[in-house]
């Protein structure tokens, strides 16, 4: 079934999709749509690229990576519960039967309730608020926004989440990366 990705309400969601252009600048049209990949192209298109540029997009949906190098991963800004569901990344390689279709399931969780302030406030200033996960494609930076105050018992939990995020990113990239040419 579809690979699953998670984000919290109010955060930006990241749905990875990559291809390797046959030559620099030799781009392939790509579409992103809400709902599983249909018979042709994408249903409910939210973003589309052509051989040169992004030629259609809707608010809150954008490509954060370098799509000219084949990183066509979708970022959805400020997600709500209504953004949950399956998304289609379709890499429209010319020729019969050549399209690559990826269905990615986005699960939106309610925002965590911010706990009351604790005495470990000084630690939070030193803790990075930008988590960078790297897979086969360009680095993806996930802005966590305002993190809750972190006490010492939460550090290992956050470290585990970061480790899981890195692992998930490696799995995602291996599953949604294709080479052309």
């Amino acid at each position: 079934s579809e690979v699953e990705y998670r984000a919290e309400v109010g955060q930006n969601a990241y749905l990875p999709c990559f291809y390797t252009p046959a030559a620099p600048g030799n781009l392939v049209p790509v579409c992103w749509g809400k709902g599983a990949c249909p018979v042709f192209e994408c249903g409910n298109v939210v973003l589309r690229t052509d051989e040169r540029d992004v030629n259609y997009w809707t608010s809150r949906y954008w490509l954060n990576g370098d799509f000219r190098k084949g990183d066509v991963s979708l970022t959805i800004e400020n997600v709500t519960l209504a953004d949950s569901g399956i998304y289609c990344c379709r890499i429209q390689i010319p020729g019969i039967m050549n399209d690559e279709k990826f269905n990615l399931k986005l699960v939106i969780k309610p925002a965590k309730v911010t706990p009351a302030p604790t005495r470990q406030r000084d630690f939070t200033a030193a803790f990075p608020r930008m988590l960078t996960t790297r897979g086969h494609g360009p680095a993806e930076t996930q802005t966590l926004g305002s993190l809750p105050d972190i006490n010492l018992t939460q550090i290992s939990t956050l470290a585990n989440e970061l480790r899981d995020s890195r692992l998930a990113n490696d799995l995602r990239d291996s599953g949604a990366t294709i080479r052309i040419g």
Epitope: A36, P38, V39, F40, G43, D99, K101
Partner: antibody, heavy 114, light 107 residues
Framework: DVQLQESGPTLVKPSQTLSLTCSVT????????WNWIRKFPGNKLEYMGY???????YYNPSLKSRISIIRDTSKNQYYLQLNSVTTEDTATYYC????????WGQGTTLTVSS | DIQMTQSPSSLSASLGGKVTITCKAS??????IAWYQHKPGKGPRLLIH???TLQPGIPSRFSGSGSGRDYSFSISNLEPEDIATYYC?????????FGSGTKLEIK
């Protein structure tokens, strides 16, 4: 809602060319993909091909030498031409559109017979 | 071409009962399967796409499941208007192929 209506002859002689028209209302044929599918008397369904929003076409390889799909955007119609028909082409022909072949005409039944 | 082997070719069931139709693909079709209901004199009607996604307006009595090469389609709480022929379609690639159809009758 999208509506499709097939029209054309009901009887064609072997070796002749079949021409069918699909009239589309509720959508423009300059967006999406516009298909022909046929159903043989034994109930088998066969995908024949499409013409896309840009005018590009795709044909089932088994028909490639005989089939042509063209369009007239000013009339919002597209057409199926099938050359050198035989009795094996006797079928009900449907024009179809939509993300998952959601919209079908009611079909037009063609008999190939001398 | 990907072959879709659909079974049974016909079946008879009682009102209120449940029926299941299967389609087996000759290779993995990555869940890209749709199911259609066809009644005489009309065009086929899309019921389900991407294995289990119900088309808007289709009752939840209809369901689909499967993965890889093996897929099934079920109708529960059978009603008289369910009398029709049902087809599967694989759309994993442009060489779209349909199953041979299952004719459903009510006892």
């Amino acid at each position: 809602d999208v509506q499709l209506q097939e029209s054309g002859p009901t009887l064609v002689k072997p070796s002749q060319t079949l021409s069918l028209t699909c009239s589309v209302t509720g959508d423009s044929i300059t967006s999406g993909y516009w298909n022909w599918i046929r159903k043989f008397p034994g109930n088998k369904l066969e995908y024949m091909g499409y013409i896309s929003y840009s005018g590009s076409t795709y044909y089932n390889p088994s028909l490639k030498s005989r089939i042509s799909i063209i369009r007239d955007t000013s009339k919002n119609q597209y057409y199926l031409q099938l050359n050198s028909v035989t009795t094996e082409d006797t079928a009900t022909y449907y024009c179809v559109s939509g993300n998952h072949f959601d919209y079908w005409g009611q079909g037009t039944t063609l008999t190939v017979s001398s | 071409d990907i072959q879709m082997t659909q079974s049974p070719s016909s079946l008879s069931a009682s009102l209120g009962g449940k029926v299941t139709i299967t389609c087996k693909a000759s290779q993995d079709i990555n869940r890209y399967i749709a199911w259609y209901q066809h009644k005489p004199g009309k065009g086929p009607r899309l019921l389900i796409h991407y294995t289990s996604t119900l088309q808007p307006g289709i009752p939840s009595r209809f369901s689909g499941s499967g993965s890889g090469r093996d897929y099934s389609f079920s109708i529960s709480n059978l009603e008289p208007e369910d009398i029709a022929t049902y087809y599967c379609l694989q759309y994993d690639n442009l060489l779209f192929t349909f199953g041979s159809g299952t004719k459903l009758e009510i006892k």
